[in-house]
């Protein structure tokens, strides 16, 4: 009947509206942390960043300097 058709159409419209909103919400929440991290330069297309590389290099150098206080570079130069 026409009433049943109208009811079904209304149900389908409501369902599609809900499904669209759910998909949008999921997409925005999925993206937010990744967008935040990309803006920080941490992530590029799913790969880890140059900042990781420099952090690792820095750690290696600090380990090296920690081995022997005598070879640690001085931050000040005598006049």
């Amino acid at each position: 009947s026409e009433a049943e058709d109208a009811s079904l159409l209304s149900f389908m419209q409501g369902y599609m509206k809900h499904a669209t909103k759910t998909a949008k919400d999921a997409l925005s929440s999925v993206q937010e942390s990744q967008v935040a991290q990309q803006a920080r330069g941490w992530v590029t297309d799913g790969f880890s960043s140059l900042k990781d590389y420099w952090s690792t290099v820095k750690d290696k150098f600090s380990e090296f300097w920690d081995l022997d206080p005598e070879v640690r570079p001085t931050s000040a130069v005598a006049a």
Partner: antibody, heavy 113, light 112 residues
Framework: EVQLVESGGDLVQPGGSLRVSCAAS????????MSWVRQAPGKGLEWVSA????????YYADSVKGRFTISRDNAKNTLYLQMNSLKPEDTAHYYC??????WGKGTLVTVSS | QTVVTQEPSLSVSPGGTVTLTCGLS?????????PGWYQQKPGQAPRTLIY???SRFSGVPNRFSGSISGNKAALTITGALPEDEADYYC????????????FGGGTHLTVL
Amino acid sequence: EVQLVESGGDLVQPGGSLRVSCAASGLTFSNIYMSWVRQAPGKGLEWVSAINTAGTVTYYADSVKGRFTISRDNAKNTLYLQMNSLKPEDTAHYYCTTGEVDWGKGTLVTVSS
Amino acid sequence: QTVVTQEPSLSVSPGGTVTLTCGLSSGSVTSVTYPGWYQQKPGQAPRTLIYNTNSRFSGVPNRFSGSISGNKAALTITGALPEDEADYYCSVYIGGGIYPAVFGGGTHLTVL
């Protein structure tokens, strides 16, 4: 919706070990840096550790360096924190975060004899 | 040891405006330290309000805004509501824009 669910918190004796986990859903886990933040009872937030997307680079607070190990299993969408040589001052709620953006509800680790 | 400083406590009247700040013991908070702001109510996990200086997290009311003011990060609440009474924490990344992260000691905000 992003969901981070921590588990594995327990009462452990000083000097003991514990591994806590964080199951992530609703996000592309393998594309996100992950971290652990803790909060001792009645105290403020303290960043503990972080790991890059591939699990190849790790970061630690001085207070846990050499005792805690962060790792991840991208196939299982799970983050881990292995805690060894535990001290009473490690007692805290441990929160899993997506680089301090999304947060889990936390799991309580109590270190006491 | 880098310390992140926050006001221990602040109060605001309902409908009023309040600004919380986040500073560094050595150096300045800049956009490259990507300051973030978090709200925590008793018995609950922290909730992100602002990340990367001024990006409002999804679902956060627009009465919350983040900025840099001088050498500090700032969180401004415009038109405060009773439900805004909580602890507020800031964080910065001090490793050249990446970890380590350091949190401030928190600000307890009273709305009365």
